[in-house]
Interface confidence: medium
């Protein structure tokens, strides 16, 4: 069955600065990933950024930067502006979708213990959309 | 197999106006492209407008300043607002979608017919 899996870094240089990194483990290829915060995509959660293999990437403030790190797996790198860190508490959501195999979604947030420029461990929670 | 519902055409005197909906009957992944186009009798299929999932909006020079595009709260449905219709605009409407984007692989509505009588 793929798997969706979601780790959300605070930077150890900048503490206003956040990166997420999500990943496909499974078959087939990545036609789409969709990321968003607050939620899981269409159900109360907002988008941050989507990545086309080949149309290229949109992103949303507060997202900075969007980019393929492999053929499987995308970072996102986030700017928080206000003071009080209100990534830190927040859930992201990665949707990656292989056409017309369906889509696979998980959720992942910054652990309260962790301490900036160490990666949350891979924790998904996988939302199966379809198959 | 996706399967594209049309609805909304009709017939309408010119200078009205009428908007057309389409809903993608397939949900389980998100449609990157999806759009109008239009055949009038004893024409080629046309392109009239597309939107893409991020929202990037292409409407064609004939239409721009009175039809509008856009994609529904619920994924993969698509509207098209018409407004300002002329005699000209009469024609088969079909929605399209491209999952890839990239027209690998598109789909077709049946088609609704639009009438604009003068």
């Known amino acids: 069955t793929p798997e969706v899996w979601v780790q959300v870094q605070m930077e150890a240089t900048e503490l206003s600065s956040f990166t997420v990194h999500c990943g496909f483990l499974g078959p087939g290829s990545i036609s789409l990933v969709t990321v968003s915060w607050g939620g899981p995509d269409g159900a109360g959660g907002t988008k941050l950024a989507v990545l086309h293999p080949e149309l290229g990437t949109r992103q949303w403030a507060p997202a900075r930067q969007a980019r393929w790190e492999t053929q499987s797996s995308i970072s996102l790198a986030l700017e928080d502006s206000g003071a009080s860190s209100p990534f830190a508490n927040t859930t992201f959501c990665c949707k990656f979708a292989s056409f017309p195999e369906g889509s696979w979604e998980s959720c992942g947030s910054l652990p309260p213990s962790s301490d900036p420029g160490l990666s949350a461990p891979p924790t998904p929670v996988p939302i199966l959309r379809a198959d | 197999q996706v399967q594209l519902v049309e609805s909304g055409g009709g017939l309408v005197q010119a200078g009205g106006s009428l908007r057309l909906s389409c809903a993608a009957s397939e949900t389980y992944f998100d449609l990157y492209v999806m759009g109008w186009y239009r055949q009038a009798p004893g024409k080629d299929r046309e392109l009239v407008a597309t939107?893409?999932?991020?929202?990037?909006?292409k409407i064609v020079d004939s239409v721009k300043d009175r039809f509008t595009i856009s994609r529904g709260d619920a994924k993969n449905t698509v509207s098209l607002q018409m407004s300002s219709l002329k005699p000209e605009d009469t024609a088969v409407y079909f929605c399209?979608?491209?999952?890839?984007?990239?027209?690998?692989?598109?789909?077709w509505g049946q088609g609704t017919q639009v009438t604009v009588s003068s």
């Open positions: 399209n979608a491209d999952p890839s984007g990239l027209g690998r692989k598109v789909y």
């Open positions: 939107i893409t999932y991020t929202g990037s909006i």
